[in-house]
Interface confidence: low
């Protein structure tokens, strides 16, 4: 027994005077606790804990389950214990089978004996298996044996406390190791939709996806910003043993514009947290905004392609597209598309192909496009850009040379006089007159020059030549004429196109 | 669901040979010993063999030892019993069952399957 | 070899009667013995096993009790669903079974 100073309150002392006592089934066990201030006895074994106020503590005939620590405490909280083991040959384990270690934690396999002079007190697998060679064990016959960190490999393992007696391998019940995994990574976190476009009065509904070893991951819908509770609703299952799926869906059943901002799926393991996000826009009625891909104004030269294209927004999805030209709608030659295959995708391509475009093509080609909220439109001016050709060509009654030319853009038209027979024009005449003629009309076509000379101030025989050039190319036409006495004779004229 | 699924049985000449099968799912069969009961119709359950969890050790009733062999296929969870030298007191329902085991050597079987017939006859 | 004997191979009984079924080994068989039931239709399932542990999903109404050789397995309130053939097992050494007793309603 404990000695301790005098004056000093001093534990209970315990008759018989042992730590351990061996009893046999069936005989008595009488416990005395000698204390002034003696309050009870408390009895332990496995979960169950019985008490006692009398200060012996007798059970008559004595069972396996009697098999325990007994504690009695005196009113100072000093307390004295002593173990009693119940030998009983039938019955050689206590067994509590709930049998739960987490991984890289030690667990106690509760199999206390009845009997503390068996011998091999063990682990044995179960059916004759072999336990894993990792697995280590430290025995105590009072509590049990403790299986030293235990993995996760050892989850479903099934196991017998085991003995010998008399030569033979005695096994208890069988325990199920059920081990519950440790954190050793973030959870995995995604989201259905990265971003949502709603119209108010819309559901709106998200799903996050929560994956780690266990259930026992946390996680939650926030609204960035604010601390407001969210109601969400969740789903779970186990794929395998140490692979849980939970999906949380957040639903706002008619969202309203104020409702717009960024929620945030947040999961927390003991191993640390992750988050994703998912933005919601929630817009009072639909919108298109179209957006050129090229000038809308064009300039392209005769017999050559272009491609009219514009990307634009629609929300919701457009219904009606389409390319007008002079009040004509396409039915081919144009192509629309979304921009993504992505299911939030908003926006959309449109592509008009002209090909080989005339100069009588050039004005104003239309894309229109609506959806159940709105209608849009936009508009290409296309200029075709066209080398000049001259109209005509002729000597007025007046004596004034004309030449009226046609082109895009604008021709200019200079005059030459090439005296006598020689092939080369170089003289620049100024003209009288010169005038655009239907400056007034569409501005898309081409557009027609007049110039006119006054032939009397030619005084030799020879060629005038009339040349319209523009950036695209350049048409001559030429007047020969000669002098008789002091008569001009009949001009001729003629032209030749100069590429 | 833990489930034990015998093959068809059916009608076989005295003398001859039939192989039943039993296909396990549900659980994990390897972690399990197995054994084969039969029922003579009109009469009661009479086990006839048992096999562990990697089939190393068998055990038969004494008077079918030569005629019958348990064994059995982990990679498959299949459950065989090859019968020889068939007799008309060989026809009965044959069961595969599960078994499991509480304390040392002591037996129970928690699993059955729905049995299959087997009918020795000329 | 242990020989396992139900005397009482037929019994009928009322609803919600207390039915007492019993069993005898020919030797001591240690508590090593398992009650089970047989359906009409063939279907056989475990009860009890070391004499009254209740298998799981086994209705409370059943129990089992004994020791040495003498064994019983008791249905306290009898139901529609409880008409079968029940049979007992040792496994004390090797196993063998009992010749059934079928309960039957009165």
């Known amino acids: 027994q404990p000695s301790v100073s005098p004056g000093e309150p001093s534990p209970p002392s315990i008759h018989p005077g042992k730590s351990d006592l061996i009893v046999r089934v069936g005989d008595e066990i009488r416990l005395l606790c000698t204390d002034p201030g003696f309050v009870k006895w408390t009895f332990e074994i496995l979960d169950e804990t019985n008490e006692n106020k009398q200060n012996e503590w007798i059970t008559e005939k004595a069972e396996a389950t009697n098999t325990g620590k007994y504690t009695c405490t005196n009113k100072h909280g000093l307390s004295n214990s002593i173990y009693v083991f119940v030998r009983d040959p039938a019955k050689l384990f206590l067994v509590d089978r709930s049998l739960y270690g987490k991984e890289d934690n030690d667990t106690l396999v509760r199999c206390p004996l009845t009997d503390p002079e068996v011998t091999n007190y063990s682990l044995k697998g179960c059916q004759g298996k072999p336990l894993p060679k990792d697995l280590r064990f430290i025995p105590d016959p009072k509590a049990g044996i403790m299986i030293k960190s235990v993995k996760r490999a050892y989850h479903r393992l099934c196991l017998h406390c085991s003995v010998d007696q008399e030569g033979k391998s005695v096994l208890s019940e069988k325990f199920i190791l059920k081990v519950r995994p440790a954190f050793k990574a973030v959870p995995v976190v995604s989201v259905s939709k990265a971003s949502y476009l709603l119209r108010e009065g819309e559901e709106f509904t998200v799903t996050c996806t929560i994956k780690d070893v266990s259930s026992s991951v946390y996680s939650t819908w926030k609204r960035e910003n604010s601390q407001t509770k969210l109601q969400e609703k969740y789903n779970s299952w186990h794929h395998g043993d140490f692979n849980y799926e939970r999906q949380a869906t957040l639903t706002i059943s008619s969202a309203r514009v104020n409702d717009s901002g960024v929620f945030m799926c947040y999961a927390n393991n003991t191993f640390g947290s992750a988050n994703v996000t998912t933005t919601l826009e929630v817009v009072d009625k639909g919108f298109i905004n179209i957006f050129p891909m090229i000038n809308t104004t064009v300039f392209v030269n005769d017999g050559e392609n272009v491609d009219l294209i514009v990307e634009y927004e629609a929300f919701p999805k457009p219904e009606h597209q389409q390319w007008i030209y002079m009040n004509r709608t396409f039915t081919d030659k144009w192509e629309d598309y979304p921009k993504s295959e992505n299911e939030s995708n908003i926006r959309y391509v449109s592509e008009l192909h002209l090909t080989r475009l005339k100069g009588t093509e050039g004005g104003t080609y239309t894309f229109l496009v609506s959806n159940s909220d709105v209608n849009a439109a936009i508009a290409f001016n296309v200029y075709v850009n066209t080398k000049p050709e001259i109209l005509t060509y002729d000597r007025l009654v007046n004596g004034m040379l004309q030449c009226v030319a046609a082109g895009f853009p604008e021709p200019t038209i200079d005059w030459y006089f090439c005296p006598g027979t020689e092939q080369r024009c170089s003289a620049s005449v100024l003209p009288v007159d010169v005038q655009t003629l239907n400056s007034s009309g569409p501005p898309f076509g081409k557009l027609v020059v007049q110039s006119s000379i006054d032939s009397s101030a030619f005084k030799h025989n020879g060629t005038v030549e009339c040349k319209a050039y523009n950036d695209v190319g350049k048409t001559s036409a030429y007047f020969n004429f000669a002098f008789k006495g002091n008569n001009k004779e009949q001009i001729h004229p003629h032209t030749l196109f100069t590429p | 669901e833990v489930r034990l699924v015998e093959s068809e049985g059916g009608l076989v000449q005295p003398r001859s040979s039939m192989k039943l099968s039993c296909t396990a799912s549900g659980f994990t069969f390897s972690d399990y010993y197995m054994a084969w009961v039969r029922q003579v119709p009109e009469k009661g359950l009479e086990w006839v063999a048992n096999i562990n969890y990697d089939g190393s050790s068998t055990y038969y009733l004494d008077s079918l030892k030569s005629r019958f062999i348990i064994s059995r296929d982990n990679a498959k969870n299949i459950l065989y019993l090859q019968m020889s030298s068939l007799k008309s007191e060989d026809t009965a329902t044959y069961y595969c069952?599960?078994?499991?085991?509480?304390?040392?050597?002591?037996?129970?079987?928690?699993?059955w399957g729905t049995g299959t017939t087997v009918t020795v006859s000329s | 070899d242990i020989q396992m004997t139900q005397t009482t191979s037929s019994l009928s009984a009322s609803l919600g009667d207390r039915v007492t079924i019993s069993c005898r080994a020919s030797q001591d068989i240690s508590n090593y013995l398992n009650w089970y039931q047989q359906k009409p239709d063939g279907t056989v399932k475990l009860l009890i096993y070391y004499t009254s542990r209740l298998q799981s999903g086994v209705p409370s109404r059943f129990s089992g009790s004994g020791s040495g050789t003498d064994y019983s397995l008791t249905i306290s309130n009898l139901e529609q669903e409880d008409i079968a053939t029940y049979f007992c097992q040792q496994g004390k050494k090797l196993w063998s079974f009992g010749g059934g007793t079928k309960l039957e309603i009165k």
């Open positions: 069952a599960r078994g499991d085991y509480y304390g040392t050597t002591y037996w129970y079987f928690d699993v």
